[in-house]
C-alpha cells in the first residue's frame, strides 16, 4: 500500500507527524510550494507541546509556519480551525503593520527568536518547517 510507518530520511518524527527543518530561507509562498512538492505542508501548530517541539528544533531564528491571512481571516494551510485552535502570538501581535515601507501589511505568520508568533511581510526570506502526517510521508526522500 501507500501508507508509511516511518518518516523519510532527514525528517524528524514526533507524535505521528514528520517534520523537516530548513536551513536556508525563502519567501512564504515559495516555502509553501517547497513543502507541497514534498507532499507536505508548512507546519501547523495545534498544541503547546507541538510548539515546544518545533521551537526546540528551529532555535532562535525567524521561521515560517503554515498560517496566513492573505485572503482576509487567519487560516491554517491544512484547514485546521484558527479561531478555536492553539495560538502563541507575541504581545500586540498580529498587528498587520504597514510601517515597514515594503508595501501592504503583514499577512504571514512566523516563529520569532523566542518562539512566539509574529505576522510579517510574506516576501521575507525566512527559514521554514514542513510537516506531513506519518502515513503520508515518503519512504525514500529525494537526495543527491
Amino acid at each position: 500500500g501507500s501508507e508509511r510507518t516511518c518518516c523519510p530520511v532527514n525528517w524528524v518524527e514526533h507524535e505521528r507527524s514528520c517534520y523537516w527543518f530548513s536551513r536556508s530561507g525563502k519567501a512564504w509562498a515559495d516555502a509553501d510550494n517547497y513543502c507541497r512538492l514534498e507532499d507536505a505542508h508548512l507546519v501547523v501548530v495545534t498544541s503547546w507541546e507541538e510548539q515546544k517541539f518545533v521551537q526546540h528544533h528551529i532555535g532562535p531564528v525567524n521561521t515560517w509556519m503554515g498560517l496566513h491571512d492573505q485572503n482576509g481571516p487567519w487560516k491554517w494551510v491544512d484547514g485546521t480551525d484558527y479561531e478555536t485552535g492553539f495560538k502563541n502570538w507575541r504581545p500586540e501581535q498580529p498587528d498587520d503593520w504597514y510601517g515597514h515601507g515594503l508595501g501592504g501589511g503583514e499577512d504571514c505568520a512566523h516563529f520569532t527568536d523566542d518562539g512566539r508568533w509574529n505576522d510579517d511581510v510574506c516576501q521575507r526570506p525566512y527559514r521554514w518547517v514542513c510537516e506531513t502526517e506519518l502515513d503520508k510521508a515518503s519512504q525514500e526522500p529525494p537526495l543527491l
Partner: antibody
Framework: EVQLLESGGGLVQPGGSLRLSCAAS????????MSWVRQAPGKGLEWVSA????????FYADSVRGRFTISRDNSKNTLYLQMNSLRAEDTAVYYC??????????????WGQGTMVTVSS | DIQMTQSPSSLSASVGDRVTITCRAS??????LNWFQQKPGKAPKLLIY???SLQSGVPSRFSGSGSGTDFTLTISSLQPEDFATYSC??????????FGQGTKVEFK
C-alpha cells in the same frame, strides 16, 4: 541505471490534443517530484509543469495553465502530460525531469531524451 | 516571475582557456542557482546546484560562485567536450523555475 524515457510527441493541428508519457526506471519513482520542461527550436529552456511524488500537488506555468494537465501513475512508474488546445507556440522538445532536493535547495538531476511536439496546420 | 539573464549569449574559446559565464537574477535569489550543460540534440545535464555544489560525476574544472543576484560559472581549463550551451536556473521561486537564455561556448 536511472532513466527517463519520453514518448507521445508528434505533429498536431492548432487546437488539437496530445498526451505525452515518461517512463521512469532505476529509482523509487513515487519518492520524487517530477517536472516537464520544454525547449522551442533555437530557444532556451522553459519549465512547464510539476507534480509531487504522490501526485497530490500540481503546478503549472502561466503559459499552459488551464490547457495542460500533469499526472502520474506510480504503480506504472509513469509521468504524463495531457496537452489540450495546442497552439503554434507550444511547438518544442518536451523533457521530463526528476526533481531532487537537498537542504532546501532543489534541481533537476535526471532528464529524459525529449520528445518533439509540433503544432502546425 | 524571476527573470534570469545570461551574458554573453555566445563566446569563442580555445582548449585550455579559462571561461567565465555570468547570470543575473531580477531579484535576490540567495544561493538558489543551478547550472546546466546542453549539447545539440541532447538533454540538459546538471553541473552545479545551490550556487557552488558540484553534481556527482562533474569534473572539478567546473565551479560556481556568487550570491544574491549575480552568479558566475567558471571552467578553469576548457576541454574539447566542454563546447556546449550553458544555462542557469533559479530555484528560489520554485515553481515557477526559470532559466537563463543560454550561453553557447564555441571553438575559436
Amino acid at each position: 541505471e536511472v532513466q527517463l524515457l519520453e514518448s507521445g510527441g508528434g505533429l498536431v493541428q492548432p487546437g488539437g490534443s496530445l498526451r505525452l508519457s515518461c517512463a521512469a526506471s532505476g529509482f523509487t519513482f513515487s519518492s520524487y517530484a517530477m517536472s516537464w520542461v520544454r525547449q522551442a527550436p533555437g530557444k532556451g529552456l522553459e519549465w512547464v509543469s510539476a507534480i509531487s511524488g504522490r501526485g497530490g500537488n500540481t503546478f503549472y506555468a502561466d503559459s499552459v495553465r488551464g490547457r495542460f494537465t500533469i499526472s502520474r501513475d506510480n504503480s506504472k512508474n509513469t509521468l504524463y502530460l495531457q496537452m489540450n488546445s495546442l497552439r503554434a507556440e507550444d511547438t518544442a522538445v518536451y523533457y521530463c525531469a526528476r526533481r531532487i532536493a537537498v537542504d532546501g535547495y532543489d534541481a533537476f538531476d535526471v532528464w529524459g531524451q525529449g520528445t518533439m511536439v509540433t503544432v502546425s496546420s | 516571475d524571476i527573470q534570469m539573464t545570461q551574458s554573453p549569449s555566445s563566446l569563442s574559446a580555445s582548449v585550455g582557456d579559462r571561461v567565465t559565464i555570468t547570470c543575473r537574477a531580477s531579484q535576490s535569489i540567495s544561493s538558489y542557482l543551478n547550472w546546466f550543460q546542453q549539447k545539440p540534440g541532447k538533454a540538459p545535464k546538471l553541473l552545479i546546484y545551490a550556487e557552488s555544489s558540484l553534481q556527482s560525476g562533474v569534473p572539478s574544472r567546473f565551479s560556481g560562485s556568487g550570491s544574491g543576484t549575480d552568479f558566475t560559472l567558471t571552467i578553469s581549463s576548457l576541454q574539447p567536450e566542454d563546447f556546449a550551451t550553458y544555462s542557469c536556473q533559479q530555484s528560489y521561486s520554485s515553481p515557477p523555475w526559470t532559466f537563463g537564455q543560454g550561453t553557447k561556448v564555441e571553438f575559436k
